[in-house]
């Protein structure tokens, strides 16, 4: 603790100029004071001034008023500093002395004589209010006041609490009257060294080094650090914890960059056609009548369906078509004839049969010819009779289908199973695909036919097909293939368009 006992001398009266021994001072009592402050004693005794002592210069002669003086010699109030916990009780001895010698340092002069003394014993609390008193004896009167205050930076009832206001990284506070800390705005904690972060800043995921700040820890973002950061490269996905990549609906792959719902995201099919998804970035447009092209973007000619009969020529119009009929025919599609068999209307050896009592006719065409007047040569490939991508070829009166590998039959309708030969080694599962068989290998094997035994690095054997990227340590199978567009499967071995029930990983 640390404080100051202050004694303010106000007035001393010694009208007769007498000493304590009854003698008078010549020419007058040149008066100075000795003050002794010590611990409380019921009976004041001689001995050391345990709380301090102080002397004044000569303050006046006989009777005088003592003025306040803040510095230098003769300072008033008198200061008795202490550096212990103030006990709340004290004993004070004030002695008035006459000196024949030096005004400034009467203590050192020989022949000093006591004029009077007073003793005060009691309790005194620390505070700014002065306690005023007056003591009389037969010859003298002394008016004075006193108090105990704490030294700078000391606080509390006994001046025992040290507190120094500060505003640095070890504390941001001022001191209360009792010595407790009062944090500056924006700071908290026992020593006011903890900043109060931006309101709402996430307790675990954010922190601050100064008030109203919110700095995010790794993996978190946003004004309040309450939004996780998804895996770097995550395109169409979100996270609930940092570095996750949970795909949005319609997206797949490690980075949610494979479009499983191209139709919805891109609307590639035009002119009211129907879009069907078929794997990552795969889709098919089914055109409405009158449209063609990959995206049904091409409008068909209104004449494309050959609506004009009997050799009529078709002309496209804005929203329709018009048939120009040959001589002897009329009607919207030149379907009505003004000819009879007498006009020999049947071409290419067709035989004419009269109808409606000779007012019209019908032609019976020889093989390889067709049309109302047998005017058209039959193209047996127009009906697209070949399935599974087979090519149709006209061969005289008949046609043949040239099948793609893996298919057979008159119309290429029969599928040749590549799996019948059991091409997959080590218990691999075989799947018939358009381009041949594909094997799904058991754990520990890889290769197109499961012929490669995996040893240490699961990606070293190149288990991913079709240019896929291999990652290890991401799944129980030791590797994961990130498929390029157009392929799926645990090894990206399946082109888009597999049966939907087939399992795959991406």
């Amino acid at each position: 603790g640390s404080g100051i006992f202050q004694l303010r001398l106000q007035e001393f009266v010694n009208q007769r100029g007498m000493l304590a021994n009854g003698q008078s001072c010549e020419p007058g009592c040149r008066t100075f004071f000795r003050i002794c402050l010590k611990h409380f004693q019921a009976t004041f005794s001689e001995g050391p001034c345990t709380f301090g002592n102080v002397s004044t210069p000569v303050l006046g002669t006989n009777s005088f008023v003592v003025r306040d003086k803040n510095s230098g010699s003769g300072r008033n109030p008198l200061q008795l500093p202490f550096n212990f916990t103030w006990p709340g009780t004290f004993s004070l001895n004030i002695q008035a002395w006459h000196t024949p010698g030096d005004d400034l340092r009467p203590e050192t002069s020989p022949g000093n004589s006591l004029i009077s003394q007073i003793i005060i014993q009691g309790s005194l609390a620390v505070g700014k209010i002065w306690r005023t008193d007056e003591q009389n004896d037969t010859l003298t009167r002394l008016s004075y006041s006193y108090r105990v205050i704490c030294s700078d930076n000391y606080y509390g009832e006994s001046c025992s609490r040290l507190c120094k206001k500060r505003d640095d990284h070890f504390g941001h506070y001022e001191c209360q009257p009792d010595g407790s800390l009062s944090c500056l705005p924006g700071w908290t904690g026992k020593y006011c060294d903890q900043p109060i972060c931006l309101s709402g800043c996430h307790e675990q995921n954010g922190y601050c080094s100064k008030p109203d700040e919110c700095i995010c820890r790794p993996g978190w973002q946003g004004r309040l650090c309450n939004e996780c950061i998804p895996h770097n490269g995550c395109r169409h996905g979100t996270c609930s914890i940092p570095w996750q990549c949970a795909c949005d609906e319609g997206w797949g792959g490690l980075f949610c960059d494979q479009d499983l719902n191209y139709c919805t995201h891109h609307s590639p099919c035009k002119n009211g056609s129907t879009c069907s998804n078929s794997g990552p970035k795969g889709y098919t447009c089914t055109c409405l009548p009158g449209y063609t092209g990959e995206h049904c973007e091409l409008g068909l000619s209104k004449c494309a369906s050959n609506p004009c009969r009997n050799g009529g020529s078709c002309k496209d119009q804005e929203n329709s078509y018009h048939c120009l009929c040959p001589p002897g025919y009329y009607g919207q599609h030149c379907e009505h004839s003004t000819l009879t068999c007498a006009d020999s209307p049947c071409f290419n050896g067709g035989s004419c049969r009269e109808r409606n009592q000779g007012s019209s006719y019908a032609c019976e065409c020889p093989p390889n010819f067709t049309g109302s007047n047998c005017e058209k040569k039959v193209d047996r490939c127009t009906s697209n009779p070949c399935a599974n991508g087979g090519q149709c070829q006209n061969r005289g009166p008949s046609r043949t289908c040239r099948c793609r590998p893996g298919f057979t039959g008159t119309h290429c309708e029969l599928h040749i199973s590549d799996c019948a030969r059991s091409p997959c080694a080590h218990g691999g599962t075989c799947h018939d695909l358009e381009n041949g068989p594909v094997c799904t290998c058991p754990a520990g094997f890889s290769g197109r036919r499961c012929e490669v035994r995996i040893t240490h690095d699961a990606c070293a054997s190149g288990p991913c097909f079709n240019g896929a990227t291999c990652y290890t340590g991401l799944s129980p199978n030791n590797f994961v293939c990130n498929c390029p567009y157009g392929f799926v499967g645990s090894r990206c071995e399946f082109p888009v368009g597999l049966p939907p029930s087939f399992p795959w990983v991406a």
Partner: antibody, heavy 121, light 107 residues
Framework: EVQLVESGGGLVQPGGSLRLSCAVS??????????WGWIRQAPGKGLEWIGD???????YYNPSLKSRVTISVDTSKNSFYLQMNSLRAEDTAVYYC?????????????WGQGTLVTVSS | SYELTQPPSVSVSPGQTASITCSGQ??????ASWYQQKPGQSPVLVIY???KRPSGIPERFSGSNSGDTATLTISGTQPMDEADYYC?????????FGYGTRVTVLG
Amino acid sequence: EVQLVESGGGLVQPGGSLRLSCAVSGGSISSSSYYWGWIRQAPGKGLEWIGDIYYTGSTYYNPSLKSRVTISVDTSKNSFYLQMNSLRAEDTAVYYCAREDVILRGGSDYWGQGTLVTVSS
Amino acid sequence: SYELTQPPSVSVSPGQTASITCSGQRLGDKYASWYQQKPGQSPVLVIYEDSKRPSGIPERFSGSNSGDTATLTISGTQPMDEADYYCQAWDRDTGVFGYGTRVTVLG
């Protein structure tokens, strides 16, 4: 018992840089009660405070060295670091790391053994 | 910049009292710490918060701080107290050390 161990000292060319490490054991660098400081002492001279860091990464530097100094922390390694660039002969000193305690009003109660950095060609 | 001034050296006889001063503008309004450093060793904190001793520091070390001066007092000085002593305070966010005082125990 808390221990601080410096490493990374040695001979450095003038104009070069140094990176010193201070490994803390026996206590967590992430405690809210401490700052972690670097102090240096040139041969035969007094102590000079370089700067300090809190576990969150807040840093404070001696204004006279601020332009050349970076202090960083790695809580996962319970270590903090001093990077100093554009070194000159007068940077030759023993470099100490120390723990500054908020409760001790910034007094440094634990010090490392020091690592000597000599800047010379 | 803030400076702390110490006498370069203080000599004391064994068993006597050594007082080391540390002066700085309004130093009494800051908390002073004192460090002891023996040759070839790291500094050791002997006084913090003006007058408090860390555990393990002998009672003969005491400190005070008011006005512009902090004082480290070693009463009953022993030969083992011969060392360099540094005062330290914080000026805003910067640590400041005094220049150091070499205490020599005579005899």
